[in-house]
Interface confidence: medium
């Protein structure tokens, strides 16, 4: 189609949108008891083999055009792809603390988007149609975040920060749980 690129490849962070962190994804459907993981200790335990410095989360820059149907952005946008291994799968204590250990199905830490930025682009359309403005959400930074299985907040933990800080002004919500659900969860923990 021979779209022409913008002359100025400057990226502008939109003041009204600014930066916003990744919304916490639901990582596990199985959540057990209301207890802080690791007893509030930092996540690097003696049984971990890797040092914090060995955790590698790479930010790979790539350039792409924003498209919407037949229309394409006049200039390409640059964003990041999060890549890299954030450490080995760790052994964690099981749900009822009998001293047995289990290995989660994936690594505890994942290299995922941490911050996003918004950028205005103008989409040029074929056939002399008027350009359309769009705001696109682009990955701005990546971070190793810890996946936690047994805690009362379904969020990704920032690497190197304290685990499961209590939330201010929020009461824990009691949930009715069936014996079957509890049993299944405990079996999953082995």
């Amino acid at each position: 189609q021979g779209w022409q690129a913008f002359k100025n490849d400057a990226t502008e962070i939109i003041p009204e949108l600014g930066e916003y962190p990744e919304p916490p994804p639901e990582l596990e459907n199985n959540k057990t008891m209301n207890r802080a993981e690791n007893g509030g200790r930092p996540p690097h335990h003696p049984f971990e083999t890797k040092d914090v410095s060995e955790y590698s989360c790479r930010e790979l820059h790539f350039t792409r055009y924003v498209t919407d149907g037949p229309c394409r952005s006049a200039k390409p946008v640059t964003e990041l792809v999060c890549s890299g291994q954030c450490g080995p799968a760790r052994l964690l204590p099981n749900a009822i603390g009998r001293g047995k250990w289990w290995r989660p199905s994936g690594p505890d830490f994942r290299c995922i988007p941490d911050r996003y930025r918004a950028q205005r682009v103008q989409l040029l359309c074929p056939g002399g149609e008027a350009p359309r403005a769009r705001k696109v959400r682009l990955v701005a930074s990546c971070k190793c975040k810890r996946l936690t299985r047994f805690h009362n907040q379904s969020e990704l933990k920032d690497f190197g920060t304290e685990a499961a800080r209590p939330q201010k002004g929020r009461k824990p919500r009691p949930r009715a749980r069936s014996a079957k659900a509890n049993q299944a969860e405990l079996e999953n923990a082995y």
Epitope: K7, A10, A130, R132, A133
Partner: nanobody
Framework: EVQLVESGGGLVQSGGSLRLSCAAS????????MGWFRQAPGKEREFVAT????????GYADSVQGRFTISKDNAKNTVYLQMMNLQPGDTGVYYC????????????WGRGTQVTVSS
């Protein structure tokens, strides 16, 4: 509201040049993009060039790329269209348009200025 007034049109020989101006007044601080469009007799209005009012990034239609240059002077609230190597196919009424922040299309238009390229 933004008011747009175009000027600089005229009659020119094929291969010649013209510089169009678009003076904006009113709520120009709310402007996101400014653009130039043209309409040839019996044809639909078509996009020519666009410029980001804040950053100055420019985009062009394929038919004018390399021949036309869009620029702006924020201090004068004016957008320019420098047209080089004009061809008879460039004949038409040239309109300046403004797209406001938050809008997805051009909402304000000038009355246009006539450009005629003779062979």
């Amino acid at each position: 509201e933004v008011q747009l007034v175009e000027s600089g049109g005229g009659l020119v020989q094929s291969g010649g040049s013209l510089r169009l101006s678009c003076a904006a007044s009113g709520r120009t601080f709310s402007t996101d993009f400014m653009g130039w469009f043209r309409q040839a007799p019996g044809k639909e209005r078509e996009f020519v060039a666009t410029i980001d009012w804040r950053s100055g990034s420019a985009g062009y239609a394929d038919s004018v790329q390399g021949r036309f240059t869009i620029s702006k002077d924020n201090a004068k609230n004016t957008v320019y269209l420098q047209m080089m190597n004009l061809q008879p196919g460039d004949t038409g009424v040239y309109y300046c348009a403004a797209q406001m922040i938050g809008a997805s299309s051009y909402g304000y238009w000038g009355r246009g200025t006539q450009v005629t390229v003779s062979s």
